[in-house]
Amino acid sequence: IWELKKDVYVVELDWYPDAPGEMVVLTCDTPEEDGITWTLDQSSEVLGSGKTLTIQVKEFGDAGQYTCHKGGEVLSHSLLLLHKKEDGIWSTDILKDQKEPKNKTFLRCEAKNYSGRFTCWWLTTISTDLTFSVKSSRGSSDPQGVTCGAATLSAERVRGDNKEYEYSVECQEDSACPAAEESLPIEVMVDAVHKLKYENYTSSFFIRDIIKPDPPKNLQLKPLKNSRQVEVSWEYPDTWSTPHSYFSLTFCVQVQGKSKREKKDRVFTDKTSATVICRKNASISVRAQDRYYSSSWSEWASVPCS
Amino acid sequence: RNLPVATPDPGMFPCLHHSQNLLRAVSNMLQKARQTLEFYPCTSEEIDHEDITKDKTSTVEACLPLELTKNESCLNSRETSFITNGSCLASRKTSFMMALCLSSIYEDLKMYQVEFKTMNAKLLMDPKRQIFLDQNMLAVIDELMQALNFNSETVPQKSSLEEPDFYKTKIKLCILLHAFRIRAVTIDRVMSYLNAS
């Protein structure tokens, strides 16, 4: 058993049928010695008397808010949460496995640049009695500071019969140098509590590996005289790290017909313009990627050919 | 990317072209190592990230773009003890800092070159003959060093009398390649920045 926060405790249980559970001793936070009784949650049934209460915690029915009283007055509370260990592996019931980029990916994180700011998000089908708390650091043995905000509900989606809820959090490394070569990964830890169930999820990454630039901005077409060709031009996104000659991007320009089946023409360039053939009803899209470190491509910025 | 690429002319700055080749070569070598050594811990998540140039060179600090010198977090430890001649500087008037930067890059390359050559000698003794260093990568390191053209003491190749532990050598190869790729990215950024300025 360990303390999650004041008066909230997590009991770690080896989770299998008929498991013996864990013996827990609760102590009433009071100078009083006599006439103390204990109850669980809203029930008035007296579980025991005395300054300490010894319980065997086996299942969720044994968890909850234990309260010690004296003469009708509440003296203190202890909330017990359960953390299930199933065959040596901590349970992951609360969050959904996003399976991208690999199995058992519960937290996904992205950064728009090298400033040390990043966003993480996760999915759940649970709509109520749910709280999250996020901590982060650079490295784990001698951690350096990363400040995270509060997790907020950022999207709701309908997936088949189920509603899916997306939560996200923004974090900022306290003293980040965009040009630094990372040798210690960022660690992100999310505590999730659903009713009386506690779970924790972690992700470890280098900012360089989670970079996903915003799409190029000011995408424009300039028709070339007496030709089906157009000059496409664009600019670096505002959110990208500067100077751009140091933090350079490379671009992919795509000409896509109205039908998804039509052949896509693609050109790769390090410049912020390209000459392409504009077909009728086609659209031109441009996306960006770090020129020197191949992390994710940005989303496409698009304009119609007409 | 095996697709048409419109590449800018390296122009007056001969090192840019070499640094691009270097990044391509080390990335290819790392990919090959990951595939060949699939039963070894060779991914970014599994290895310890060690920098053999730590406390010996300070490329990131010495080569910091002017725009980032205002960032307190980037100014931890600026070294100022490098040699100041080099052919990449020939065509333009350069600052003392730029000379320090290029000389720091040269020292990095020299250290990695020695490590890789020592490692290759060990790998050639492996009866499994599982992996060797790409000669193209070693050649590209050499070409960039020649383009930088700094006079510097030659570092003798490390020789070891004891029987090599091939498992450890292959893991060390992965560690070195990951670190060298990160340094190659920095070098490419620096060359691109210097070329633009």
Partner: antibody
Framework: QVQLVQSGGGVVQPGRSLRLSCAAS????????MHWVRQAPGKGLEWVAF????????YYADSVKGRFTISRDNSKNTLYLQMKSLRAEDTAVYYC????????WGQGTMVTVSS | SYVLTQPPSVSGTPGQRVTISCSGG????????VKWYQQLPGTAPKLLIY???QRPSGVPDRFSGSKSGTSASLAITGVQAEDEADYYC????????????FGTGTKVTVLG
């Protein structure tokens, strides 16, 4: 004490269907994940499927994906395996078992797919 | 598609020490704990070892398990006639958890 009693096995022709049941008692069935494991005659153990405690997630071996469906009725304390498009290679003793560091197995039920 | 490899058979005389190996990789044994089962003819498997080296109550202490890196082993010190059975190791794999990953199985024969 924990008990898992299996039923539903038998002889069936290729292409036909069969539903296995596993009745649980002696524990809070709705709190635990459950597996199906099979063993072909004279062969080793092969995992077939898993279902979470609340039925929210199901996982299948590639060899049965799209043909077998694992389900549970927590109000009846029963686990099911619906087997469709049966093949000769599905012939085996099928076991249900609890998920956890200590596990409990059903007695096994024989499924024979033969024409 | 067994990824955990066991020797097909091992044998020993009563009182001898018998060991069974179970070889895997970084994504299975290297990442998860290992269990060992004993299966007597015509019966369901019985758990002998969980968590690499833990014995459930009721399992004789002549059975012991260990794990090192990407392989595990089961030792029977002072093998007895009633130990003649099939033995299976079991773990998980990073790519497929919670699918159970079983070893190929080992037939233990007690001679004499």
């Amino acid at each position: 004490q924990v008990q898992l009693v299996q039923s539903g096995g038998g002889v069936v022709q290729p292409g036909r269907s069969l539903r296995l049941s596993c009745a649980a008692s002696g524990f809070t069935f709705s709190s635990y994940g459950m597996h199906w494991v099979r063993q072909a005659p004279g062969k080793g153990l092969e995992w077939v499927a898993f279902i979470r405690y609340d039925g929210s997630n199901k996982y299948y071996a590639d060899s049965v994906k799209g043909r077998f469906t694992i389900s549970r009725d927590n109000s009846k304390n029963t686990l099911y395996l619906q087997m469709k498009s049966l093949r000769a290679e599905d012939t085996a003793v099928y076991y249900c078992k609890t998920h956890g560091s200590h596990d409990n197995w059903g007695q096994g039920t024989m499924v024979t797919v033969s024409s | 598609s067994y990824v955990l490899t066991q020797p097909p058979s091992v044998s020993g005389t009563p009182g001898q020490r018998v060991t069974i190996s179970c070889s895997g990789g970084r994504s299975n044994i290297g990442s998860y704990t290992v269990k060992w089962y004993q299966q007597l003819p015509g019966t369901a498997p019985k758990l002998l070892i969980y968590g690499n080296d833990q014995r459930p109550s009721g399992v004789p202490d002549r059975f012991s398990g260990s794990k090192s890196g990407t392989s595990a082993s089961l030792a029977i010190t002072g093998v007895q006639a009633e130990d003649e059975a099939d033995y299976y190791c079991q773990s998980y794999d990073r790519g497929t958890h919670p699918a159970l990953l079983f070893g190929t199985g080992t037939k233990v024969t007690v001679l004499g």
